[in-house]
């Protein structure tokens, strides 16, 4: 077919020599063919295109890729071709990098049902170079873990060294999907949870006196599960005394937090020092009180049925540990006066 | 080091019972969820009941629903499966697996397993 | 009830060869997807959690990955010791039907 009504775009792929790492191209048909093979999801139910030109299925793996061949050469079937190079749906995902992928790389629907269709194509130019030494050293990876439950970010790592005030706007797309709130070179999450892993694509477009092309970048963002390096801390009690009524009964409660640990056993009990003698107390169960994914709040009571006066003699020691270690807190009843 | 140790499997007549014991060592069962899963002789791996005890909650295959129980004693570190009325294709090697159930309980992975006790369902 | 859908069921490959094991969820599942590995007689073992994160422990040749409901396992190059039966399961949070495995593909030697 005639591939000089389709519409062109130029990418930029600048890959390290260090590292593994994958590229993508999206199949950018033209709108409103787009939302109709690839992207439909990108597009909020009040902007469904009032047409859809194309009227195959919608199925979203109906789009067929090429590859032009410099010699001049007929267009050759991706699938048939180039075994590191696998489609899904609508993108076409590089497994390794290398000059020999630059090329061109052509998109069309594979059912034409209409005049229309016969120039419902993308030409992608894609130019692929190794980074230079010059480039900067501290780049982000093309792998990014973020910690669950903890905040995180995820950076472009063909804008990594740059600072936020400098850095150009960029298009962010998780999973083919456009991100459109985010156009800085880092994403923020707040809190990560499992459904923030990813194949992420950065994109942004770069000029000279001549032309203009989109530099790309694609991370793999993972979302990981981290064993705290803490010890639990305690949050009540605070106060190392305590004003009691005599004869009354009391109840001492102690909570402390526990950061995650994969294998979670984490001890909290209630002894009691007199002079130079200490037991543990049996107290109720503990029970945990608040579960996020970065704390587990586990609280232990002590309960005196009515406080005595060799009780104010005494020292009421709260003890919590993990697998990093103890903390304690002690308690000394005090007479209330008055 | 952590350790599921399985007890209870043998031969046993199709409308019997049979109680199988998940004995855990080197961590808090509470503060995780046990789950059992069996594997017929030659087949895939076929999840069968899970209990949380931090949350109270039992949830069962439909399999096996209103025939199996799942228990647990965490103070006896140990996790049941009483199953009764048993058919022929109850037999399988039974695994018991946890995975970790404390901050929020989000799911990552059986991530230690029994050796397995195989329950044979025959006349 | 979720269905995971395992392809393929077994497969022949060479050590140094890239192999790639799909699991199809039949409605939209989060992330909480493992990865198994099982050798005869043995009990399973967790290679991959939360769809892409690798167990510790767990030879970086493994990895998975997810787009949309279809979750992959690759393993960059297969060595000896990874012939067995792989099998992939779902978790739905609070959900009847909790744990689901996939029918499992077994990994042989051409």
């Known amino acids: 077919f005639n591939i000089s009504g389709c519409s062109t775009k130029k990418l930029l792929w600048t890959y390290s020599t260090r590292s593994e790492e994958e590229f993508v191209l999206f199949c950018d048909l033209p709108e409103p063919q787009k939302s109709h093979f690839c992207h439909r999801n990108r597009l909020s139910p009040k902007q469904v295109p009032e047409h859809l030109p194309f009227m195959g299925s919608n199925d979203l793996s109906d789009v067929q890729w090429y590859q032009q061949p410099s010699n001049g050469d007929p267009l050759e079937d991706i699938r048939k071709s180039y075994p590191h190079i696998i489609q899904d749906k609508c993108t076409l995902h590089f497994l390794t990098p290398g000059v020999n992928n630059s090329g061109s790389y052509i998109c069309r629907p594979k059912m034409i049902k209409s005049p229309y269709d016969v120039a419902c194509c993308v030409k992608m130019i894609l130019e692929v170079k190794p980074q230079t030494n010059a480039s900067c050293e501290y780049s982000a990876s093309h792998k990014q873990d973020l910690l669950l439950g903890s905040t995180g970010s995820i950076s472009c790592p063909s804008l990594s060294c740059q600072s936020d005030a400098q850095s150009p706007a960029v298009t962010w797309y998780k999973n083919g999907k456009l991100l459109s709130v985010e156009r800085s070179n880092r994403i923020v999450v707040d809190e990560v949870y499992d459904y923030h892993q990813g194949t992420y694509v950065c994109d942004y477009t770069q000029s000279d006196t001549v032309s203009s092309w989109t530099v790309r970048a694609v991370v793999q963002v993972r979302t990981i599960v981290g064993d705290t390096k803490l010890k639990p801390d305690i949050l009540d009690p605070v106060e190392d005394t305590l004003e009691v009524e005599l004869g009354k009964p009391l109840t001492i409660s102690c909570k402390a937090r526990f950061g995650f640990e994969r294998v979670f056993n984490p001890v909290i009990k209630w002894y009691i020092k007199d002079s130079d003698l200490e037991w543990e107390v049996s107290v109720p169960e503990a029970k945990s009180i608040k579960s996020t994914l970065k704390d587990e709040i586990i609280e232990r009571n002590i309960i005196l049925e009515k406080v005595t006066q060799r009780d104010l003699r005494r020292k009421f020691v709260c003890f919590v540990q993990n697998s990093i270690g103890n903390t304690t807190q002690s308690v000394q009843l005090k007479e209330k006066r008055g | 080091e952590v350790q599921l140790v399985e007890s209870g499997g043998g031969l046993v007549q199709p409308g019997g019972s049979l109680r199988l014991s998940c004995a855990a060592s080197g961590f808090n069962p509470y503060y995780s969820s046990i789950h059992w899963v069996r594997q017929a002789p030659g087949k895939g791996l076929e999840w069968v009941a899970s209990i949380s005890p931090s949350y109270s909650s039992t949830y069962y295959a439909d399999s096996v629903k209103g025939r199996f129980t799942i228990s647990a004693d965490t103070s006896k570190n140990t996790a049941y499966l009483q199953m009764n009325s048993l058919r022929a294709e109850d037999t399988a090697v039974y695994y018991c697996?946890?995975?970790?159930?404390?901050?929020?309980?989000?799911?990552?992975?059986?991530?230690?397993w029994g050796q397995g006790t195989l329950v044979t369902v025959s006349s | 009830d979720i269905q995971m859908t395992q392809s393929p069921s077994s497969l022949s490959a060479s050590v140094g060869d890239r192999v790639t094991i799909t699991c199809r969820a039949s409605q939209s599942v989060s992330s909480a997807v493992a990865w198994y590995q099982q050798k005869p007689g043995k009990a399973p073992k967790l290679l991959i959690y939360s769809a892409s994160s690798l167990y510790s422990g767990v030879p970086s040749r493994f990895s998975g990955s997810r787009s949309g409901t279809d979750f992959t396992l690759t393993i960059s190059s297969l060595q000896p010791e990874d012939f067995a039966t792989y099998y992939c399961?779902?978790?739905?949070?609070?959900?009847?039907?909790?744990?689901?495995f996939g029918q499992g593909t077994k990994v042989e030697i051409k």
């Open positions: 697996a946890r995975s970790s159930c404390s901050h929020s309980c989000r799911f990552y992975g059986l991530d230690y």
């Open positions: 399961q779902q978790y739905a949070y609070h959900e009847p039907g909790l744990l689901t």
